[in-house]
């Protein structure tokens, strides 16, 4: 069972009075059907709330929206709809917040029946807005350059690519028949275009273009493109191979000047590739199995994105809605959780602590019993509910949650058995990055992390009854207190807290409804008086991440180094504060074979750390295409894992010789790549069917 809420369990004294003094109700007097909330800037306290009401009448949609602004983390709101001339703002991609702390906001208005559109833009955290007419109708949310918030990119509903260099004041058309466009690094724009005029029918016949000067000049960096994606420092393109409908992945680390063919299986038209996660060191790539299997294989790359090791087979990734449970546990380096589809068609959770090197089932929580799915009532695992469970309609209100500044903490819905259960899930918490788990709350909840883990807040999911209680824990979910934030329950719709988990404020959103009247309401609770004092040195203790064997000198070594953290003692009730920085001390480990992946032409037999030559390549020269040149590889089968920092110890030798021969795949050679100045290409629109799933870097 979950920890009790008894009188003595980590009880914070006088918390009811302290929270009552810091609970702020705001009633929104409008009847809108939906509400969306955006935080403007970091630590500014500014929140924009857009409420929208839409009614479809014949072929058109009549809509109305209201805009509210708070500058005290949601305690009070002011109706600022008049700043945007009471214009209807689209709820689907209406609010675009600028990167970092730019204070920039773009609202996209819905101007029905027009050939153009209208935006409202603010550079002062939504205090003032300037109206601007657009010469196009946006197809998706306007994209800010990550490097310069004055540079905006937009794709129109006619598949034209538009750019603005002065924060939306003036727009220039860059290109026609653009299917997909993305900002790269250094204000570079990548896009695919099709001169045949369609994006939906001619997948695989696209050209990949790049402009590094906001459209003054263009360069074709690829042809026969099916799709492309960016992940970390890698640019990926899936390219038709010339062998019927097969396509293969090509990778570039120099913005598309040179390409190498990734050592990954090619896929057919009914399959897909997906970058699950990427950083500057490596990539997790999912390769779909043939047929409508609903699963595929995860491969992990080397530091060039070229050589791949098989990481996890039967990885669940549905083709229908593109659901995968793949989750990066951001609170501990190297940890990822996902699901596999077992031979018996059951869905099971797996976890890796070493960036995909090895996967295991999640350890059963000590305070839990195996459910009915377990063949052996003593032996079972924790299974985590994520995107797949939500898509299948299970009562899972939230995805797994972790935050980089709340070290080691993972919160997730789960069930304990041989596989994921369709029964009502409970909330489980890990304080060590997923090595051990505890049942924290009975039944489904919404949850959030405040003050870098100093407080965890939860609200029970109750679809049929109103909600008037919030639960909170000051000891990482071991003990929970319950606070009634209102006498009259509300129909609860969600929790909102400032991204980054540094805030002490939580907003509970919902609505009240009667026969003739419905209105939105929010309760914002400030926990500053619960955590009365600032944390001091004595409130922190040492924690060795990834510790599994304290007697071992190499205990905690993952990817060649171990990390000691200063972590808040669970019993300390104090504020980490907004300026809290995670204190950690890395130390380098000796190299072992675990620090190396198998090189091109080698593989690891199951339960073996040695790399063995692939039988089909034995006795052959290992030659492969790299950066457009043929290379000869002399290796004893090992290559250091990307990001691995080990030194000394085992050190396998490796040498690559340039064969001075040119080679290309079905890709344009660098010398054949053409450039051209700005000019528009003909062709009519089409639909872009690439989508960005949550936390998924790229899905074809």
């Amino acid at each position: 069972s979950a920890p009790g809420e008894d009188e003595e369990c980590g009880r914070v004294r006088d918390f009811v009075a302290k929270l009552a003094n810091n609970t702020h109700q705001h009633i929104f007097n409008d009847l809108s059907g939906s509400v969306s909330l955006s935080w403007v800037g970091d630590s500014t306290g500014v929140i924009l709330v857009l409420t929208t009401f839409q009614v479809p009448i014949f072929m058109i949609t009549i809509g109305q929206s209201k805009l509210y602004r708070s500058e005290d983390y949601g305690k009070n709101f002011k109706d600022i709809t008049d700043l945007i001339n009471n214009t209807f703002i689209r709820s689907d991609f209406g609010i675009a917040i600028g990167p970092e702390n730019s204070g920039k906001v773009v609202l996209t208005a819905d101007v029905s029946g027009s050939h153009g559109s209208r935006i409202f833009r603010s550079s002062d955290f939504a205090k003032n807005f300037v109206q601007q007419e657009l010469p196009f109708v946006p197809l998706m949310q306007i994209m800010y350059s990550p490097q310069n918030s004055d540079y905006l990119l937009a794709l129109s509903n006619k598949n034209e690519l538009w750019v603005s260099k002065n924060f939306g004041g003036k727009w220039e058309k860059l290109y026609d028949t653009v299917c997909l466009a993305k900002w790269g690094s250094d204000n570079t724009i990548f896009f695919t275009a099709n001169h045949n005029g369609s994006c939906s029918n001619d997948r695989g016949m696209l050209e990949l273009w790049r402009t590094s000067d906001l459209g003054k000049s263009f360069k074709t960096i690829g042809s026969k493109i099916y799709s492309f994606g960016l992940g970390g420092r890698f640019l990926f393109a899936s390219v038709m191979t010339g062998k019927g409908t097969l396509r293969a992945i090509h990778v570039s680390t120099d913005q598309g000047d040179t390409w190498s063919m990734a050592q990954l299986p090619p896929v057919g038209h009914e399959q897909f590739y997906s970058i699950l996660a990427a950083n500057d060191d490596m990539v997790f790539m999912h390769v779909d199995e043939p047929g409508d299997s609903g699963f595929g294989t995860i491969f992990t790359s080397d530091d060039r994105g070229i050589v791949y090791s098989k990481s996890l087979e039967r990885h669940l990734y549905t083709t229908t809605g593109g659901e995968t449970d793949f989750t990066n546990v951001t609170s501990l380096r190297g940890v990822y959780i996902t699901s596999i589809l077992a031979e018996d068609k059951s869905v099971q959770s797996m976890i890796t602590f070493d960036q995909g090197g090895r996967w295991t089932h999640l350890r059963k929580p000590e305070n839990s019993k195996c459910d009915a799915t377990a063949r052996d009532p003593e032996k079972c695992s924790l299974h985590i509910h994520a995107a797949y469970s939500i898509a299948t309609g299970l009562n899972v209100p939230m995805l797994p949650l972790s935050e980089p500044n709340a070290v080691g903490i993972v919160i997730a819905h789960g069930s304990v058995g041989d596989a994921i259960s369709v029964m009502r899930p409970d909330v489980y918490i890990s304080d060590d990055g997923g090595y051990s788990w505890t049942k924290a709350l009975e039944g489904p909840h919404h949850y959030t992390i405040l003050d870098s883990g100093g407080i965890i807040v939860a609200v029970e999911q109750n679809a049929h009854q109103g909600v008037n209680q919030i639960k909170f824990s000051t000891d990482e979910g071991q003990c929970w207190q319950t606070y009634n934030f209102t006498k009259d329950p509300i129909f609860f719709t969600g929790l909102a807290s400032e991204p980054g988990a540094r805030s002490m404020n939580i907003s509970i959103w919902g609505y009240r409804s009667s026969l003739f009247h419905q209105y939105w309401i929010s309760y914002t609770i400030d926990f500053k008086d619960i955590l009365e004092r600032n944390c001091e040195e004595k409130d922190y203790t040492i924690w060795l991440a990834h510790s599994t064997d304290p007697e071992d000198y190499e205990d905690g070594c993952i990817l060649g180094y171990k990390e000691q953290f200063l972590r808040l003692r669970k019993s300390s009730v104090c504020q980490n504060g907004r300026d809290y920085v995670v204190t950690k001390q890395p130390s380098i480990c000796l190299c072992s074979l675990e620090d190396f992946l198998c090189d091109f032409g080698y593989y690891r037999p199951e339960n073996d750390s040695k790399c063995v030559e692939q039988p089909e390549l034995k006795g052959h020269d290992l030659e492969f295409c790299l950066y457009g040149r043929e290379e000869h590889l002399t290796t004893n089968g090992y290559r250091k894992i990307p990001g691995d920092k080990c030194q000394g110890g085992v050190n396998p030798v490796r040498e690559v010789k340039d064969l001075k021969k040119k080679c290309t795949s079905n890709f344009l050679s660098p010398e054949k790549q053409n450039s051209k100045s700005n000019g528009s290409a003909g062709g009519s629109g089409g639909l872009n069917d690439i989508f960005e799933a949550q936390k998924i870097e790229w899905h074809e």
């Epitope: 040195e537 040492i542 924690w543 007697e551 000198y553 000691q564 200063l566 019993s571 001390q585």
Partner: antibody, heavy 122, light 107 residues
Framework: QVQLVQSGAEVKKPGSSVKVSCKAS????????ISWVRQAPGQGLEWMGR????????NYAQKFQGRVTITADKSTSTAYMELSSLRSEDTAVYYC???????????????WGQGTLVTVSS | DIQMTQSPSSLSASVGDRVTITCRAS??????LAWYQQKPEKAPKSLIY???SLQSGVPSRFSGSGSGTDFTLTISSLQPEDFATYYC?????????FGQGTRLEIK
């Protein structure tokens, strides 16, 4: 196997100082906090303070504040406890103790030194 | 400082007996309580942490319970090697404090 080996017994005059060492072997010294606990003859256990060697953070019980200094030398895997202005009631066995591994068990001492008897007598 | 009070201060029991030692904290310490066993001229040995979790290698006849301010250590069937002094320790807040000890003697 983790071992904490302490320096030998000391006889000190009132008003003087004593410095007791605690050398760790087996496992990694830097991975844990080291606490000092004393036990007067026939009495109970009394916590004096702790050090987190890798971060150089030391905390002391209020009772000993200003009189005790806990330090660590990472290169030799040794922790030190120095107690100044000694008085007869400081006569006790002084233990160093290491935190239990695991985040839920901090300041539960699973490894102890053999103890160092400090006698304060004029 | 949090005061830890053990009772009884001493008790006599026979091999095979069930023995319970209690420990009371002057304020709530959640479950941040440990128990130690100490034999004459030896360093203490950790038995239980987090109120009820057994240290590895400690026989299962030892168990702990409680929460908040009241805690107990139970030895289900006394063995000859169990005769010693037992201490509770709170690590909820600084300074860490110990109970005054319970001396368990052979009857």
């Amino acid at each position: 196997q983790v071992q904490l080996v302490q320096s030998g017994a000391e006889v000190k005059k009132p008003g003087s100082s004593v410095k007791v060492s605690c050398k760790a072997s087996g496992g990694t010294f830097s991975n844990y906090a080291i606490s000092w606990v004393r036990q007067a003859p026939g009495q109970g256990l009394e916590w004096m303070g702790r050090i987190i060697p890798i971060f150089g953070i030391a905390n002391y019980a209020q009772k000993f504040q200003g009189r005790v200094t806990i330090t660590a030398d990472k290169s030799t895997s040794t922790a030190y406890m120095e107690l100044s202005s000694l008085r007869s009631e400081d006569t006790a066995v002084y233990y160093c103790a290491r935190d239990r591994r695991g985040f839920s068990g901090y300041e539960v001492f699973d490894y102890w030194g053999q103890g160092t008897l400090v006698t304060v007598s004029s | 400082d949090i005061q830890m009070t053990q009772s009884p201060s001493s008790l006599s029991a026979s091999v095979g007996d069930r023995v319970t030692i209690t420990c009371r904290a002057s304020q709530g310490i959640s479950s941040w309580l440990a128990w130690y066993q100490q034999k004459p001229e030896k360093a203490p040995k950790s038995l239980i942490y987090a109120t009820s979790s057994l240290q590895s290698g400690v026989p299962s006849r030892f168990s702990g319970s409680g929460s908040g301010t009241d805690f107990t250590l139970t030895i289900s069937s006394l063995q000859p090697e169990d005769f010693a002094t037992y201490y509770c320790q709170q690590y909820n807040s600084y300074p860490i404090t110990f109970g005054q000890g319970t001396r368990l003697e052979i009857k």
